[in-house]
């Protein structure tokens, strides 16, 4: 069935080299004395990307990250020595790895680093206006970074700075065991989660923190933490990880007698991201890696995108799940998880829940308590012993919107852009992986908005070496994506419409909401443009409908490439054809000489089909004829190539090979009438290669060709060196190619 195509593969796969050559990536490859470009802060107003790294903080220009300023913030030699004496790694641990980088006010940033296992914070002056061009460390004002940054650079931290107060989920001790959600800075006593209580936090890995309004009353504002942690005993058989969303009220100041300087409104719930499996056993993606909040129209109800991976070492998989805040709130208003002792099962709490309900923020909206310090003892006692909700939060549509299980990589990061297209709004996801690639995925509603189809548009390699992507930011203003890793920072445009092809059908098939056919090219779609001139169909990607008036003989206004190939009887030949789109299915037709009828080629021992084309083994005269290569995608058929194969019988070949180089045999003339002078030379070489009994390898043969070529060059100074390069090119490709475009020009595969 040629209708379906391959939806789970990226339509375009671009290598780092291809990204560079097409000017689609700008990379900052790091400094020799730095690394770990993991902490991002995007400032659209100033058009800057601030990046925290090892011993450095950078300020990159959003237009071009090659233009940057830097602050060097290392630790003292004494501090580094102390760290080394404590048995830590001098390069990987005994440095100042920046973990917190937040806007403090209009003129300053707040930054915290590991400080060689002695967390430290300071302020960075950035000036009032972008044109001030200020970027400097406040050397006179260093603060204890404990409870803000971890000691250990390997540990994750999630932080949020609002109204001069820093909320952070981190490890507060040297050993990396005392994990807590803290509120520090500001004028109040620091507040934290309960110590020594695995029901609150159980070896968590913090992902991110977000402020989300609950109502129009700011007193109801909550801070939500996303993290993963070890499942509590009794929640799961064996050791397991659970993804979590935790909430705290912004106006929580701790209890009066109990939970003094501890959160009284902390609650957490499990985030489920799973695929229903056979026998009722679901495949769970529990390792939450990243979260992105899509704020649109209503800031109280952002859509939460979560990137998850599997916990298993045997089965590696990744998924993206979407959650609605109304579902999250419903769970926090549902039953609390309860158990009577360590050996009991967790059950929904059935008893009387004290008033005001634990987890409710003290405000005029939901009751008459002005402060958490005024909360009744029974509320505090209940909150302390019931931090978890019984019901989990299920994703929208009860399943992931993106799943990847058959690949050698895992998802690490996500950012999402909402794009206006001709037929509606689409969320385009940019997903970072642990091998340095970025996937561009669009979720397209099918029958209902909840029933989404995942379309993988592109897979782009953004770093020279495979390296895990650890940070991503998206600038809607600049229409650029910024990516961080241990190795450096990369910048790429959100769209590269021209890369899809030069035809309406190709543009339409891409189903990229950013792009539309403008009559002459595939270019950026703007909703304001005149409608009738733009061709785009994201929902269906149907070029037959949208490009029908532009069709010519080949459905897309372009005649197929035509080639003539010569093969030798009993030898093999390769007909090269691979579409630009990886999603297209290729099928071949054969048309005998002087016949109208075309038949589909069936694969057997004689004919082998590969991703790159068709290999015909042990050629016979009956193989002569026209071979048509078609690409089928989304029901649209495109003829890419028409190859005419001429099979030369062995007798003729013997004649040819024994002719003098400059001989004038009539057969040679007959065969070569379609060849340029430079092609004739390598054609003879090619014949020798595929049928010579004494040359076992291509390398051996190429060596002979190059030797002869050098000899000829010495004899004839005016000779243009064309052929040896062709052979070298072939040899390079033999080492392992990853071609994505029509490269039919390559010798000696086609003439």
């Amino acid at each position: 069935n040629y209708q379906n195509g391959k939806n789970n593969v990226p339509r375009l796969k671009l290598s780092y080299k291809e990204m560079l050559e097409s000017n689609n990536v700008i990379t900052f490859n790091g400094l020799a004395n730095s690394s770990s470009y993991h902490t991002f802060l995007l400032d659209e107003e100033r058009s800057r990307l601030y990046v925290g790294a090892k011993d450095h903080i950078f300020s990159f220009d959003l237009v071009n990250i090659k233009d940057f300023q830097k602050i060097v913030w290392p630790v003292s030699y004494t501090r580094r020595d102390e760290c080394k004496w404590a048995g830590k790694d001098i390069l990987k641990e005994c440095a100042n790895f920046i973990k917190v980088l937040k806007a403090y006010n209009q003129t300053h940033l707040y930054a915290c680093g590991t400080g060689a296992f002695h967390p430290i914070c300071t302020y960075i002056e950035i000036g009032h206006h972008p044109e001030d061009n200020i970027f400097k460390l406040e050397n006179s004002h260093f603060e204890n970074g404990r409870g803000k940054s971890p000691y250990d650079p390997k540990l994750l931290t999630a932080s949020l700075l609002i109204d001069g107060e820093l909320y952070s989920g981190t490890a507060a001790d040297f050993m990396g065991r005392d994990f807590a959600i803290f509120r520090t800075l500001g004028h109040h006593h620091p507040i934290r989660t309960e110590q020594h209580d695995s029901r609150w936090l159980n070896d968590p890995k913090f992902i991110s923190a977000h402020l989300i309004s609950e109502s129009d009353n700011p007193e109801d504002d909550k801070v939500y933490f996303f993290f993963r942690e070890n499942a509590i005993d009794g929640e799961h058989s064996g050791k397991a990880t659970h993804a979590r969303i935790g909430q705290i009220c912004k106006n929580d100041f701790g209890g009066h007698r109990s939970l003094v300087n501890k959160w009284t409104t902390f609650l957490k719930a499990r985030l489920i991201c799973s695929v229903p499996g056979p026998n009722g056993i679901d495949t769970h993606f529990d390792e939450l890696q990243d979260v992105f909040l899509m704020n649109f129209k209503d800031p109280k109800n952002p859509v939460v995108y979560g990137v998850f991976t599997t916990s298993s070492n045997i089965f590696k998989g990744s998924a993206v799940c979407m959650y609605s805040m109304s579902d999250v709130r419903r769970v926090f208003l549902g039953p609390y998880a309860h158990r009577d002792g360590p050996n009991y099962q967790w059950v929904p709490y059935q008893g009387r829940v004290p008033y005001p309900r634990p987890g409710t923020c003290p405000s005029k909206t939901f009751g008459g308590f002005d402060s958490t310090k005024d909360l009744p003892d029974d509320v505090i006692t209940f909150a302390r012993s019931h931090p978890a909700m019984y019901n989990p939060v299920f994703p929208m549509n009860n399943r992931p919107i993106v799943i990847k299980t058959d690949v050698n990589y895992q998802f690490t990061q996500i950012v999402v852009d909402r794009v206006d297209a001709e037929d509606g709004q689409y969320d385009v996801m940019f997903i970072g992986t642990d091998v340095g690639t970025v996937l561009k995925v669009v979720s397209i509603p099918k029958e209902t908005w909840y029933d989404l189809e995942e379309v993988l548009l592109e897979e782009m390699t953004v770093f020279r070496e495979p390296t895990a992507i650890s940070a991503m930011e998206l600038s809607t203003k600049q229409q650029q994506l910024y990516i961080g890793s241990t190795a450096g920072v990369a910048q790429l445009p959100l769209h590269r419409c021209d890369i899809y092809g030069k035809a309406c059908a190709e543009c339409c098939l891409a189903r990229d909401p950013y792009c539309a056919w403008d009559g002459s090219a595939c270019s950026r779609y703007f909703p304001t443009a005149k409608r009738r001139t733009r061709r785009q169909d994201i929902r269906n990607g149907d070029p037959l409908t949208h490009c029908s008036d532009l069709h010519h003989d080949n459905h897309h206004g372009h005649s197929p490439e035509e080639r003539i190939i010569y093969g030798v009887e009993n030898s093999s030949t390769f007909l090269e054809c691979s579409p630009k789109s990886q999603r297209a299915l290729v099928y071949w037709q054969f048309q005998r000489r002087n016949e109208e009828r075309k038949e589909e080629i069936r694969v057997d021992d004689h004919i082998i089909r590969t991703d790159q084309g068709l290999l015909l083994r042990s050629l016979q005269q009956k193989d002569s004829g026209n071979y048509l290569c078609h690409a089928v995608e989304h029901g649209f058929i495109q003829t890419l190539l028409k190859v005419t194969l001429e099979v030369i019988d062995t007798e003729h070949l013997e004649e040819l090979l024994h002719k003098d180089d400059d001989g004038d045999g009539s057969k040679t003339k007959e065969m070569s009438n379609s060849m340029t002078p430079s092609q004739k030379v390598w054609y003879r070489d090619f014949m020798q290669l595929i049928n010579h009994p004494n040359l076992n390898t291509m390398d051996e043969f190429c060596e002979q060709v190059w030797k002869r070529d050098r000899k000829q060059r010495r004899q004839r100074p005016g000779h243009t060196p064309g052929n040896s390069n062709k052979w070298k090119h072939l040899q390079e490709n033999k080492k392992g190619r990853n071609r994505r475009t029509h490269e039919f020009e390559r010798a000696p595969r086609s003439v």
Partner: antibody
Framework: EVQLLESGGGLVQPGGSLRLSCAAS????????MNWVRQAPGKGLEWVSG????????DYADSVKGRFTISRDNSKNTLYLQMNSLRAEDTAVYYC????????????????WGQGTLVTVSS | QSVLTQPPSVSGAPGQRVTISCTGS?????????VHWYQQLPGTAPKLLIY???NRPSGVPDRFSGSKSGTSASLAITGLQAEDEADYYC???????????FGGGTKLTVL
Amino acid sequence: EVQLLESGGGLVQPGGSLRLSCAASGFTFDSYEMNWVRQAPGKGLEWVSGISWNSGWIDYADSVKGRFTISRDNSKNTLYLQMNSLRAEDTAVYYCARSGYSSSWFDPDFDYWGQGTLVTVSS
Amino acid sequence: QSVLTQPPSVSGAPGQRVTISCTGSSSNIGAGYDVHWYQQLPGTAPKLLIYGNSNRPSGVPDRFSGSKSGTSASLAITGLQAEDEADYYCQSYAGPNPYVVFGGGTKLTVL
């Protein structure tokens, strides 16, 4: 007024067992982490064991691990230390102490102490 | 041997100022953990004297003050009085194994 009152000390032979108790009053017992700290005759202080308000966290010094068991009964406002396989080096005054967490960084301090009970391990 | 190092003894005449040092390492005091001080009068239980490096619980005279720098902390007593004669212990959080550590104690003698 906060009060901690230890009991259960005495003379015991090596290899023997003892159970210490600490009765708490004057504060909300089930809100606090509690500890046992000991002091050998003429020596300094040594933290022995700690337990969280709901017994979810329990920890011991390496020197007593596997031999001592800390527990609490919040309904009785009482802290316990079960000591088995006692050795001569366990001879000390055993204090019951409340974790105050008074400092801004929540580092454990001991804001109230009992008067102590003497445990002598000797044959 | 204690993890935190204190001088075994210090002495001073009434009215004088004395300081007691407490030296740790990068995994306790040097890690940014708070230091607390206790006073143990002869034949009694220890009493919290200073918490969080420099804070006094109510009832503790302001003659007692604490400070911390790097991997060390110190307790200063000004206007020394006869009733200050006692053993003084510093204590810090140490993370697991052990949970907390004490100094070996310093005997203060008022001459």
